[in-house]
Interface confidence: low
Amino acid sequence: IWELKKDVYVVELDWYPDAPGEMVVLTCDTPEEDGITWTLDQSSEVLGSGKTLTIQVKEFGDAGQYTCHKGGEVLSHSLLLLHKKEDGIWSTDILKDQKEPKNKTFLRCEAKNYSGRFTCWWLTTISTDLTFSVKSSRGSSDPQGVTCGAATLSAERVRGDNKEYEYSVECQEDSACPAAEESLPIEVMVDAVHKLKYENYTSSFFIRDIIKPDPPKNLQLKPLKNSRQVEVSWEYPDTWSTPHSYFSLTFCVQVQGKSKREKKDRVFTDKTSATVICRKNASISVRAQDRYYSSSWSEWASVPCS
Amino acid sequence: RAVPGGSSPAWTQCQQLSQKLCTLAWSAHPLVGHMDLREEGDEETTNDVPHIQCGDGCDPQGLRDNSQFCLQRIHQGLIFYEKLLGSDIFTGEPSLLPDSPVGQLHASLLGLSQLLQPEGHHWETQQIPSLSPSQPWQRLLLRFKILRSLQAFVAVAARVFAHGAATLSP
């Protein structure tokens, strides 16, 4: 058993056949010594008396809010949550496996630049009685600070018969060093509580591996005289690290006909302009990627040829 | 050429070669099925690798103040990786395919290190750890880890030379 936060405790249970469970001793937070009784949740049934209560926690029926009273007055509470290890594996029932980039990916994170700011998100089908708290650090043995905000519900989607909820959190490394080569990964830890079930999820990554620039901005076309060619120009996104002579991007320019089946013409360039042939009804799209490290491409920025 | 004690390197040549190194490092080891090598307990492998750290002066401001600290750090790393790529880890079984980019990568590391330090000048170099994996699968894993770590190192080096070529070239 360990303390998650004040008056909230997590009991780790091997969810096993005939497992004896965990013996837990609760102590009433009061100077009083006698006349103390204990109840669980909303029930008025007295579970025991005395300053301490010893219980055997085996299943969810044994978890909940234990309250000690004296003469009708509440003295203190202890909320017991369960963390299940089932068939040798800690339960991961609360969050959905996003399966990208590999199985058992519950948390996904992205950064728009090298400033040490990143966003993580996760999915669940649970709509009520759900809380999350997020902690993060750089490295685990001698952790350096990363500050995370509160997790918020960022999107709701309907998937078949189910509703899916996306939560996200923003974190910022306290002493980020954008130009350095990371040697210790960022660790992100999410505590999830659904009713009386506790689970924790972790992700470990280097910022360089989760970089995904915003799309290029101010995408413009300039027709070239007496030619079907156009000059496409764009700018670095505002959110990208500066100076651009140091934090450089590379770009992919694509000409795409109206039908998805039409052949796509692609040009790769380190410049912020390119000359391409503009076909009728086609569109021109540009996306960006770190020039020197193959992390994710940005989403496309697009303009119609006409 | 960067002569210890002060003069500038051939920024543009270094820029071109370091960008080529980035391309080679990624073609030698694309993200293989997103193999997460940090899960494989790699403390003893990559902790000894020279990293370009915050105090090494490789940020734009540090380069403007005195690029020598940073160039020395990059030189150290290039020599370190050049030795690793020429070691039993890459030359032993399972042998690399004949057209593997590792050979070119090895030669380019050497080329860039020589651009930074001509014959007769000696910056201190870091000792290469004695890594002699006993099993072919361990060697394969070690190669992946070294190449992943090299990708991060050469990315920073390429940024340094690109910025130098754009802002510090005579």
Partner: antibody, heavy 114, light 112 residues
Framework: EFQLQQSGPELVKPGASVKISCKAS????????MNWVKQSNGKSLEWIGV????????TYNQKFKGKATLTVDQSSSTAYMQLNILTSEDSAVYYC???????WGQGTLVTVSA | DIVISQDELSNPVTSGESVSISCRSS???????????LNWFLQRPGQSPQLLIY???TRASGVSDRFSGSGSGTDLTLEISRVKAEDVGVYYC?????????FGSGTKLEIK
């Protein structure tokens, strides 16, 4: 008294599907994962996958992905396994087993034959 | 996947003797929590498997103390003392340290 009662034997044609059931009684159905295991003609046991009856979440053995689909009906405390596009290789006894593998159903024999 | 190896047949034993059945795992089943995630089952002819031992050495409810489990993270042993006729059947070990859970091929126990 705790029990896992499986549906009876099935004789099915190649290419068809079959859905076998496992009804739990004597305990809180949603509190315990349900595993499914295959045993081909006196051979060893192969783990197919597991479902959490409370959330409906599943984990499959890669080998049985696309072959087996695990579902539950909480109202009747019943776990189901559907086997698709059956071939002779799928002829076997299939067991459900509660978390920890302490309790097993009696097994359902599936025979695939033209 | 973790591969579990078992010998197919144990030498026939006489009633009252002891016998050990071994099982080897391609990866350690010993977790950081100090527990070894291995089960032992007995499948008697025509019956469902019966859990004998879980967590390598803990006897399941109602299982005779003649059965005991031991081992390291990779080499595991089931010991049956004072063998009886009712112990005949196939003994399987199973790892539940990692998905997919895997079983050994089974060891058949015969009595002379």
């Amino acid at each position: 008294e705790f029990q896992l009662q499986q549906s009876g034997p099935e004789l099915v044609k190649p290419g068809a599907s079959v859905k076998i059931s496992c009804k739990a009684s004597g305990y809180s159905f949603t509190d315990h994962n349900m595993n499914w295991v295959k045993q081909s003609n006196g051979k060893s046991l192969e783990w197919i996958g597991v479902i959490n009856p409370n959330y409906g979440t599943t984990t499959y053995n890669q080998k049985f992905k696309g072959k087996a689909t695990l579902t539950v009906d909480q109202s009747s405390s019943t776990a189901y396994m559907q086997l698709n596009i059956l071939t002779s290789e799928d002829s076997a006894v299939y067991y459900c087993a509660r978390r920890g593998f302490a309790y097993w159903g009696q097994g359902t024999l599936v025979t695939v034959s033209a | 996947d973790i591969v579990i190896s078992q010998d197919e047949l144990s030498n026939p034993v006489t009633s009252g003797e002891s016998v050990s059945i071994s099982c080897r795992s391609s990866k350690s089943l010993l977790y950081k929590d100090g527990k070894t995630y291995l089960n032992w089952f007995l499948q008697r002819p025509g019956q469902s498997p019966q859990l004998l031992i879980y967590l390598m050495s803990t006897r399941a409810s109602g299982v005779s103390d003649r059965f005991s489990g031991s081992g390291s993270g990779t080499d595991l042993t089931l010991e049956i003392s004072r063998v009886k006729a009712e112990d005949v059947g196939v003994y399987y070990c199973q790892q539940i340290a990692e998905y997919p859970f895997t079983f050994g091929s089974g060891t058949k126990l015969e009595i002379k």
